[in-house]
Every structure is written in C-alpha cells, then in structure tokens.
Amino acid sequence: GSMGHAPKVGRLIYTAGGYFRQSLSYLEAYNPSDGTWLDLADLQVPRSGLAGCVVGGLLYAVGGRNNSPDGNTDSSALDCYNPMTNQWSPCAPMSVPRNRIGVGVIDGHIYAVGGSHGCIHHNSVERYEPERDEWHLVAPMLTRRIGVGVAVLNRLLYAVGGFDGTNRLNSAECYYPERNEWRMITAMNTIRSGAGVCVLHNCIYAAGGYDGQDQLNSVERYDVETETWTFVAPMKHRRSALGITVHQGRIYVLGGYDGHTFLDSVECYDPDTDTWSEVTRMTSGRSGVGVAVTME
C-alpha cells in the first residue's frame, strides 16, 4: 500500500487484510459513489480472520491470524488506522488471541466476540474503551463460537452462527450490556459459520457462510419485533469467510471463499427490490477480510 496521505472523501468501504495463499496486509477502500478503489497503508502485520469496525472516525483492525510460510500465529492485536494521516498505530492487545473473531460497537466501545487460539474455541467476550486504551472481559457467550457474525441493533449485541469446535451452528444469542448477560434468540433457518452479519432497517441479516458441507448463497434476516428469521433473495455467489457492511441503506458483501475460488466479487443488496447485483471487483480475490465503513 502507498504511504501518502489518503484523499479526503466521504463514506468509504474499507477492507483490511484477508487471505490468498497467505495472510495479507492490504488496506483498500472502495468509493461506491464513483466505483474507484484506493490503495492505502498496509497493515503492519499481515492477517486474515480479522474483524474491522469504526469508532470516532478511526478504523480498527481486531484479531485474526498471520498464516504465512514462516508459520501461523493467532493475533490478539488491535490496530488503529487514521484516514486523515493514512497511518496505522498499535493499541492495547486483547487478553487472548482471537482468529475468526466477530466485533460490534456499542456507545463507542468495541466488543470482541469469540474466535480461536489454536484449538481453543472461545466463548469469552471483551470490551475495549478507546479513550482509556483498555480491554475488560464481560460475560461470556453461552456458546463457543469462531467464524461468528456480530451485529449491533438498538444497543444490543448479537452473535450469530459460527463453529464451536465440533458443530457448525444455526444458533444465535444476544448480549444485554446493562445486565451483562447473554440470552439465546431464535435460531436461524440455516446452519452458518463464517457468514456475513450486519444490521439494516431494524433487521439483522445473515448472508452466506458454510453449513459444514457447502458454502451458501442464501440470506436470511431476523426481525427483532417478531423474533423470526425470513429468507430474502440469495446472493449470486456462494461464499463463506466473506466481508460485509452497510453503506447508504444497502448491504455490500466482499470476497470470501466459494469452495473452489477466492472471490474478488463484491455484491450489493437493495432491500427495496430484494435483489443482489455485482457492483465491483476487489483488486484480487481473498477470504477472511475485515470490513468497515467510515462515518459521515
């Protein structure tokens, strides 16, 4: 990636890291308004299976692992990217390494959910306070989950699907910060590990993933009012270990693995028409990226 100053533009979709033959250090940003990609400052350490989020206009890369020819190291790292300076800086590490982690943000705090360290599949969850640069453990999930999808809706944290070390999961659970407790919610219709999970229009969407046999292109959404999961239109490509985010009322899914190929495809879902369309391609195929959108 280039080390010059990033152009000052509006909302961009950032994709960090990922995997193709080895863990990647790329940081790239897609501008949906003009369809262009920016090549930005590389991560200081390559990583895949990471998660991305934005707090206070800064992009955070959380967890993952560095799978390289020199070895395979799970990451406890938290790194912060400033779009104004196009530079990464390290923050306090998590209490444990977390590969294939999920993250969510509530009230400016980052929640790191599940993930794995070697053969250990975590149910533990920890919260980062950017102003103090500190992590603190909160209540553990009811289920061990790696490849977990995480989303925040109405200041509640949802952990969806994943893999507990023995089984891929269709179960989901919800964390109540005020009570510091987790409760199970209605299970998805489909077992999904490595799905893309996000929130759009008061619903939680779960896209793609892997059911223990095959990659999926199906998509379902959870209505918190009715507590039910309903299928919507499927993606054009089957994909697991995909990146996902929401930009201007549409869902974007980036890359992933289809069982044969590392996808460069980026698809966009329009909830008004219940359709997916191919909108761009990443500069190269990859799985296990961290994705987030800059704030206005």
Partner: antibody, heavy 120, light 107 residues
Framework: EVQLVESGGGLVQPGGSLRLSCAAS????????IHWVRQAPGKGLEWVAS????????LYAKSVAGRFTISADTSKNTAYLQMNSLRAEDTAVYYC?????????????WGQGTLVTVSS | DIQMTQSPSSLSASVGDRVTITCRAS??????VAWYQQKPGKAPKLLIY???SLYSGVPSRFSGSRSGTDFTLTISSLQPEDFATYYC?????????FGQGTKVEIK
C-alpha cells in the same frame, strides 16, 4: 464406507515436480479438512499440509512451505498435493487423511499411502 | 513449533503385559492429543483422541490419560495384534507434530 486413495507417487529427480492425488469416497471433502502426512523410510510421521474447507486457508510445515501446494476439487471429491523443487529429503510415503471434528482434533481415516522417491 | 517427546523409543513385552507409553509436550497443548497405531507397510490407525477418548471400534484395553503436559497411552493387557509402532500427535496448534514413535516388540 469412508475411503481415501492416494496416487501420483513415483521416482523423480531432485528439483523435479510431482502431483499427488487423494480421491475420497464415502464422504464429501467439502465437509472436512484434508491433511497430508509423510513418513520417510524407517522414520516417524511428519505432518505436511492441510486445507480448511470453510475459509480455503492452507497450512504447511516449514520444511515444505513455498515448495508444496495443497488444493481440493470438490466436484471431483479429490485433494491434491503439488510438490515442486523436490529434494532427496522429501523421499517418503505420503498419506492423505481426513480431519475429524468428532472425533475431535484427530485424523480418523487415512489412505494407504503413495511412495515418492527423489533420487538422481 | 511444539515438540512431542515420546518414550520409550522401543520396548519388549509379552502377551498379557500392561504397557505404558508416554509423550511430553514442550508447552501446554490442552487435551488436543491423539494416539495412533501403525503396523509395517500400513497406514496409521486412530486409537485415542482428545487425550483420553476411545475412538469407535478400538478395544477397551487401550486408554489414554493426561497430566499437565504429559500424556500416556496404556494397553492394559497386550494382545498379539498389538505389536506395532505407536505415535502421539498434538493438534493444539499448527504445525501439528508427532512424537518419534514407540515400537512395541515381542519379548
């Protein structure tokens, strides 16, 4: 019945290449990670490589990283080990094995092995 | 990489004997240890997984145990078909590593 059958071994000169195949039946390789393990003549077992069916990520022993490539073709239910820049110390019987999640964290089915001899 | 140090490298025993083989991990591997049996010219066969769980179809005279980073395979009463080489394997983290093997021979 679960079965794994390796093929593609043989005699190759140092610096040469071989592609091993592991044909699976009785289960879908899309449902398990596949591993390659080798055994030099009169020696013990050495883990070589694996491929994860969910993420596509591959792992390699340091001794083969950069020279060997593991892959899978789910439509043929077959895994492969592409071996380049072969050395005398790569001479071994190569086994493919299925990684079981239940049994947890172990290789529950193995092929019969295929012999690779690297010699001039 | 995690080393698995297996001992003894060989042992002689008689039918009916109780046989114990040990593996020591160079660092914590939790219970992510398996034991395999291999006979000459054949592929290894899984005996024990998760340190102490008996794999389906394996005779109950085989058992595994863990004490910290020490792992033990015990054959309570050696049978003629048990003369073979035994390997431990850790899969706590990759690269996965095997012990050097223990050859169980007829006394």
């Amino acid at each position: 019945e679960v079965q794994l059958v390796e093929s593609g071994g043989g005699l190759v000169q140092p610096g040469g290449s071989l592609r091993l195949s592991c044909a699976a039946s009785g289960f879908a390789i899309s449902a398990s990670s596949i591993h390659w393990v080798r055994q030099a003549p009169g020696k013990g077992l050495e883990w070589v490589a694996s491929i994860d069916p969910e993420t596509g990520e591959t792992l390699y022993a340091k001794s083969v990283a950069g020279r060997f490539t593991i892959s899978a073709d789910t439509s043929k239910n077959t895994a492969y080990l592409q071996m380049n820049s072969l050395r005398a110390e790569d001479t071994a019987v190569y086994y493919c094995a299925r990684w079981g999640y239940e049994p947890y964290m172990a290789m529950d089915y193995w092929g019969q092995g295929t012999l690779v001899t690297v010699s001039s | 990489d995690i080393q698995m140090t297996q001992s003894p490298s060989s042992l002689s025993a008689s039918v009916g004997d109780r046989v114990t083989i040990t593996c020591r991990a160079s660092q914590s591997v939790s219970s992510a240890v398996a034991w395999y049996q291999q006979k000459p010219g054949k592929a290894p066969k899984l005996l024990i997984y998760s340190a102490s769980s008996l794999y389906s179809g394996v005779p109950s005279r085989f058992s595994g145990s863990r004490s910290g980073t020490d792992f033990t395979l015990t054959i309570s009463s050696l049978q003629p078909e048990d003369f073979a080489t035994y390997y431990c394997q850790q899969s706590y983290s990759f690269p996965s590593t095997f012990g050097q093997g223990t050859k169980v021979e007829i006394k």
